[in-house]
């Protein structure tokens, strides 16, 4: 039951984790205007990773999308690359974590499919967790650069009398939210993890012993890994005929009581 | 069609307040931010602040800050603006006028202006 | 606060003749996010409210005769009537739209000869 709730809860929380990539992703507001300190415009900027914007006073928007490949900084790439990858990798995680709960009965899947199943969306979770902190990260420490560059020439004489303030730019909402996200996924990757384990328990190698008691020799028949829903025997869903065992193959798995929540 | 109409001229005495108001119609009121500027006699254009109607946010021009009130009515599309401690140098047309949409914060119909004369 | 400054004071043209008044900021009035020009020109006619002409330095308001014509970036601007006409007569003002508090220059008033 523990174990059902645990993945039950890894997989929420991944899913949170990974909408909110998405929209980290999507928004326009990865570096804002900084208005601290900063003379007071008329117009508010904001850029995300596919455009920039202008709002003006009035309220009225204008987006233009970064239409060149070339032109754009490597870093930008970097981020944009890191964030796609989280992405991808986590809808696979949710579509694989999905076949893997133990709430959901799919034909004949075995536990021990549903434990390797698990595990491998808890890594993949994991990564994609991973990919967004880390793309969030080193937008935010590009922001930083550049923000203490622009400080220091935060006036540009053009000649003269005049000069030219330059926009300096501060954390957006996006990287916030792409922290928290990538974070909710890589805890619900962690506890995808913890899940499997409690899914495939350590066992003996050896399934089955047959005895012989009028003979000297001991016939071990093993057995491949086996997952079960709990830490006890598992032999509750095994046909056992005379006392013999049967090898992994062969066992017919039928749900329990357990296996609905 | 848009209208900004402004209230009669007024006299008033150093030291005292003036209120003018600004009656919208046309428009949707609330949506658009409207601006106070005045115009001393063969002097140019000042800008004293703007409020918008939709929530009552205000932005004041530092020079009038403390003398300066920006309130609107939106049951009547009204926007007033009182001045207080009112100086000689105060004498001038004032126009509130309304912020265009997507017109580079730029004004875009204008009030026929209210005549306040600062005399002792 | 921004200081906009507009030349000639004055000028007195023949009809049909061309005229440019210019505007100088004293910082740039360009939003490097959108690349557009923060500054807008305004006609004022003698007893009249302004009038909007130009919004972002080039952008003519709808209903203004095409004859106007405003350029310029950055810090320094231009309006131009290629064809002076008799109801041209007014001053022009050109207001700094970017910054706060917004400021207008001392305007340019336009005669016929």
């Known amino acids: 039951m523990a174990v059902t709730a645990c993945q039950g809860l890894g997989f929420v929380v991944s899913l949170i984790g990974i909408a909110g990539i998405i929209a980290a992703t999507c928004m326009d507001q990865w570096s804002t205007q900084d208005l601290y300190n900063n003379p007071v415009t008329a117009v508010f900027n904001y850029q995300g990773l596919w455009r920039s914007c202008v709002r003006e006073s009035s309220g009225f928007t204008e987006c233009r999308g970064y239409f060149t490949l070339l032109g754009l900084p490597a870093m930008l790439q970097a981020v944009r690359a890191l964030m796609i990858v989280g992405i991808v990798l986590g809808a696979i995680g949710l579509l694989v974590s999905i076949f893997a709960l133990k709430c959901i009965r799919i034909g004949s899947m075995e536990d021990s499919a549903k434990a390797n199943m698990t595990l491998t969306s808890g890594i993949m979770f994991i990564v994609s967790g991973l990919c967004a902190i880390a793309g969030v990260s080193v937008f935010a420490n590009m922001l930083v650069t550049n923000f203490w560059m622009s400080t220091a020439n935060m006036y540009t004489g053009m000649g003269g009398m005049v000069q030219t303030v330059q926009t300096r730019y501060t954390f957006g909402a996006a990287l916030f939210v792409g922290w928290v996200a990538g974070g909710l996924t890589l805890i619900g990757g962690v506890m995808m993890c913890i899940a499997c384990r409690g899914l495939a328990p350590e066992e003996t190698n050896y399934k089955a012993v047959s005895y012989h008691a009028s003979g000297h020799s001991v016939a071990y028949k093993p057995g491949g890994f086996k997952a079960s829903t709990g830490f006890g025997s598992n032999t509750k869903n095994k046909k056992i005929y005379d006392g013999g065992a049967r090898t992994e193959d062969e066992v017919q798995s039928y749900p329990s009581k357990h296996d609905y929540v | 069609q848009v209208q900004l109409v402004q209230s009669g001229a007024e006299v008033k005495k150093p030291g005292a307040s003036v209120k003018v108001s600004c009656k919208a119609s046309?428009?949707?009121?609330?949506?658009?931010?409207i601006h106070w500027v005045r115009q001393a006699p063969g002097q140019g254009l000042e800008w004293m602040g703007r409020i918008y109607p939709g929530t009552g946010n205000t932005y004041y021009n530092e020079k009038f800050t403390g003398r300066v009130t920006m309130t609107r009515d939106t049951s009547t599309s009204t926007v007033y603006m009182e001045l207080s401690s009112l100086r000689s140098e105060d004498t001038a047309v004032y126009y509130c006028?309304?912020?265009?949409?997507?017109?580079?914060?730029?004004?875009?119909?204008w009030g026929q202006g209210t005549t306040v004369t600062v005399s002792s | 606060d921004i200081v906009m400054t507009q030349s000639p004071d004055s000028l007195a043209v023949s009809l049909g003749e061309r005229v440019t008044m210019n505007c100088k900021s004293s910082?740039?009035?360009?939003?490097?996010?959108?690349?557009?020009?923060?500054l807008t020109w305004y006609q004022q006619k003698p007893g009249q409210p302004p009038k909007l002409l130009f919004y972002?330095?080039?952008t003519r308001e709808s209903g203004v005769p095409d004859r106007f014509s405003g350029s310029g970036s950055g810090t320094d601007f231009t309006l131009t009537i290629s064809s002076v006409q008799a109801e041209d007569v007014a001053v022009y003002h050109c207001?700094?739209?970017?910054?706060?508090?917004?400021?207008f220059g001392g305007g340019t008033k336009l005669e016929i000869k």
């Open positions: 207001q700094n739209a970017y910054y706060y508090p917004y400021t």
């Open positions: 006028a309304r912020e265009g949409y997507g017109k580079g914060n730029s004004m875009d119909y």
């Open positions: 972002w330095a080039s």
């Open positions: 046309g428009y949707i009121f609330t949506n658009y931010w």
């Open positions: 910082q740039s009035l360009l939003n490097a996010g959108n690349q557009k020009n923060y």
